[in-house]
Interface confidence: medium
């Protein structure tokens, strides 16, 4: 959080920013910033692999849900969107793109279809879907 | 947009931030920042007047929809939430808290109930509702 004092000295001018206010980011231009994570919702429908590649091309990854508190904005998201959660058949676990295992009680996993990829839906639900099915998707970039 | 060069001189250290990235805000702590507007979704149900007072107490106002482009994050919002749109019986117009008139084609107004207040619903819909009915609400703060 940058205080008004710091900003005043920075710009050598009067900028009255309450101490309870802060800048968020940095994020790619026109992305949503929340609790220093960056999110973007993409309208075009792509399969999971193409969605992943699209996020990669923007130096981001598909949505990773890691905290109901830090990501409570997600509870109000309408519709279904690819996230970075995949089923690893060899060990039966659900894991994120970065290799971390899905924490218990974070998502309610619902078998909508046979598949190894998951769609995010409101109120922290994950719908299993065939990875080849086109859907909209959410990219996420964690700031340092 | 603050370039990496500026940030380097600011902090006198290596901060590689692409020129296409930017900080958003300032916003109240833990609010959503998007295209330099600040939003917060409140879970507790209040009537329109209490919702307005709650936003005011945080130096904000109830949601004002002014641009489908600049506020396209709103199309994905689930459920119904009070916004700052009210019906003025004397002239029959819908106007925002700041007195500005609702621009044509911004919202599809749907008469859900008899009333003079409006709930925001996804895809830029406004549902007419009795102002005394408790609902969740969205506060908004426009940054300078």
């Amino acid at each position: 959080i940058w205080s008004a004092v710091f900003l005043n000295s920075l710009f050598n001018q009067e900028v009255q920013i309450p101490l309870t206010e802060s800048y968020c980011g940095p994020c790619p231009k026109n992305w949503i910033c929340y609790k220093n994570n960056c999110y973007q919702f993409f309208d075009e429908s792509k399969n999971w692999y193409e969605s992943q590649a699209s996020c990669m091309s923007q130096n981001a990854s598909l949505l990773k849900v890691y905290s109901k508190e830090d990501q409570d904005l997600l509870k109000l998201v309408k519709s279904y969107h690819w996230m970075g959660l995949v089923h690893i058949p060899t060990n039966g676990s659900w894991q994120w793109e970065d290799g971390s295992i899905l924490s218990p009680n974070l998502l309610t996993i619902i078998e909508m279809q046979k598949g190894d990829c998951a769609l995010y839906a409101s109120s922290f639900k994950g719908y299993i879907e065939n990875c080849s099915t086109p859907n909209t998707y959410i990219c996420m970039q964690r700031t340092v | 947009i603050w370039s990496a060069v500026f940030l380097n001189s600011l902090f006198n250290q290596e901060v590689q931030i692409p020129l296409t990235e930017s900080y958003c805000g300032p916003c109240p702590k833990n609010w959503i920042c998007y295209k330099n507007n600040c939003y917060q979704f409140f879970d507790e149900s209040k009537n329109w007047y209490e919702s307005q007072a709650s936003c005011m107490s945080q130096n904000a106002s109830l949601l004002k929809v002014y641009s489908k482009e600049d506020q396209d994050l709103l199309k994905l919002v689930k459920s119904y939430h009070w916004m700052g749109l009210v019906h003025i019986p004397t002239n029959g117009s819908w106007q925002w808290e700041d007195g500005s008139i609702l621009s044509p084609n911004l919202l599809t107004i749907i008469e859900m109930q008899k009333g003079d207040c409006a709930l925001y619903a996804s895809s830029f819909k406004g549902y007419i509702e009795n102002c005394s009915t408790p609902n969740t609400y969205i506060c908004m703060q426009r940054t300078v």
Epitope: E50, S57, N59, E97 | -
Partner: antibody
Framework: QLQLQESGPGLVKPSETLSLTCTVS??????????WVWIRQPPGKGLEWIGN???????YYNPSFKSRVIISVDTSKSQFSLKLNSVTAADTAVYYC???????????????WGQGTTVTVSS | DIQLTPSPSFLSASVGDRVTITCRAS??????LAWYQQKPGKAPKLLIS???TLQSGVPSRFSGSGSGTEFTLTISSLQPEDFATYYC?????????FGQGTKVEIK
Amino acid sequence: QLQLQESGPGLVKPSETLSLTCTVSGGSISGSSYYWVWIRQPPGKGLEWIGNIYSSGSTYYNPSFKSRVIISVDTSKSQFSLKLNSVTAADTAVYYCAKPLLRDYYFYGVDVWGQGTTVTVSS
Amino acid sequence: DIQLTPSPSFLSASVGDRVTITCRASQAISSYLAWYQQKPGKAPKLLISPASTLQSGVPSRFSGSGSGTEFTLTISSLQPEDFATYYCQQLKSYPWTFGQGTKVEIK
């Protein structure tokens, strides 16, 4: 086992278009998780990623080539192609077509390579 | 773009030596780093990816370590067939980038 073979002219004149084709044999070119890649190596220098194409046709290009590169796929011929226009002497290189290793839904490098084809840009 | 800086650029060593090559990324790339070996006139060969996982058929004298921005390729006992150029590559985000390479020569 999967094999890749580049083909195309070895000599291209400056300002013209470099066109290369990669033929995939010993396996399918299309599938829900099939990506293909072009990489080049100028003489005596390092490797440079040009771009990827997904079997459905989605492409991802290196921004340093973006305005003049087109990668396409023809699943019926089991081929994918590279076109690089407005070439200069700096585009002289060995061009490789390749397949990234996609395992557990993430790229783990490039594990299948063509033998490479040398393209010289000269008048 | 994510830059990869290998060190050293050149390395003279003898058969049996332990050789270590490092690759530094300009930003954190988790474990999304691959190591390749390339011999003159040949296509590169994938040795290790992600970061520390040896690809099948690659001798166990090769090993990789690291995460984030600092990565290491180690050859525990250099063999005659290991004299080559070694490249690192990041696959965390597009554009995929390679380091400029480390040439391992016979001393």
